[in-house]
């Protein structure tokens, strides 16, 4: 045993249309707010009921978001990631990693 836990993951491109109340999910993570040990990536922490993401159905709590509209989310401060989502426009393309 090397002490590391390996997970099966799959990647997916999810295209969301911003709804009346936005994209409808929360995020955690970032270089200044690591939520997952030794990983400063951005993760979905909550999906708002009846929000755009929930109605689409593909994004799940615990998913890692790799990019937004083609922009890599590596090495971002938490608030910079939040601002990126808030300013992402009407049609938002997410590259996400689901853990199986």
């Amino acid at each position: 045993m090397n002490g590391r836990v390996d997970y099966l993951v799959t990647e997916e491109e999810i295209n969301l249309t911003r709804g009346p109340s936005g994209l409808g999910f929360n995020i955690v993570g970032g270089t200044d707010q690591q939520y997952v040990s030794n990983d400063s990536g951005i993760y979905v922490s909550r999906i708002k009921e009846n929000g755009a993401a929930a109605l689409d159905g593909r994004l799940q709590e615990g998913d890692k978001i790799l990019s937004v509209n083609g922009q890599d989310l590596k090495n971002l401060l938490h608030q910079d990631a939040v601002d990126l989502f808030r300013n992402a426009g009407y049609a938002v393309s997410l590259r996400v990693q689901h853990r199986l």
Epitope: P20, S21, G22, L23, G24, F25, N26, I27, V28, D32, Q33, Y35, V44, S45, R46, K48, E49, N50, H78, Q79, V82, F85, R86
Partner: nanobody, 128 residues
Framework: DVQLVESGGGLVQAGGSLRLSCAAS????????MGWFHQAPGKEREFVAE????????GYADSVKGRFTISRDNAKNTVYLQMNSLKPEDTAVYYC?????????????????????WGQGTQVTVSE
């Protein structure tokens, strides 16, 4: 889960000030967005203000901008609402709320559906 306990409410004259506090239990307090809502008799619970986990981002309802200030002390697991220039229409029960992570949507759209954890509330009464 997070438990929230509000304090600091009371009776104040119009033009006066109050400072509400909300003490939270939980070891990952800085990962939670914290908010304040109020509910007047016979009305729905309405958004007042919110603050991001690090305190670097805040949002306010139009009705309180310039009068109310939200802040937090992550070392004390506490969020505050400084309420100045109070008006009789500010009279309501004030609730502290918490949700894990940061909403990717502007606080312009905030509602009670955006929060998962709630305190019991503290009454604020502003007299003429």
């Amino acid at each position: 889960d997070v438990q929230l306990v509000e304090s600091g409410g009371g009776l104040v004259q119009a033009g006066g000030s109050l400072r509400l506090s909300c003490a939270a239990s939980g070891h990952t307090f800085s990962s939670y967005t914290m908010g304040w809502f109020h509910q007047a008799p016979g009305k729905e619970r309405e958004f007042v203000a919110e603050i991001s986990g690090t305190g670097g981002n805040t949002g306010y309802a139009d009705s309180v901008k310039g009068r109310f200030t939200i802040s937090r002390d992550n070392a004390k697991n506490t969020v505050y609402l400084q309420m100045n220039s109070l008006k009789p229409e500010d009279t309501a029960v004030y609730y502290c709320a918490a949700v894990i992570g940061s909403p990717t949507d502007s606080s312009d759209y905030r509602s009670s559906l955006d929060y998962d954890y709630w305190g019991q509330g503290t009454q604020v009464t502003v007299s003429e």
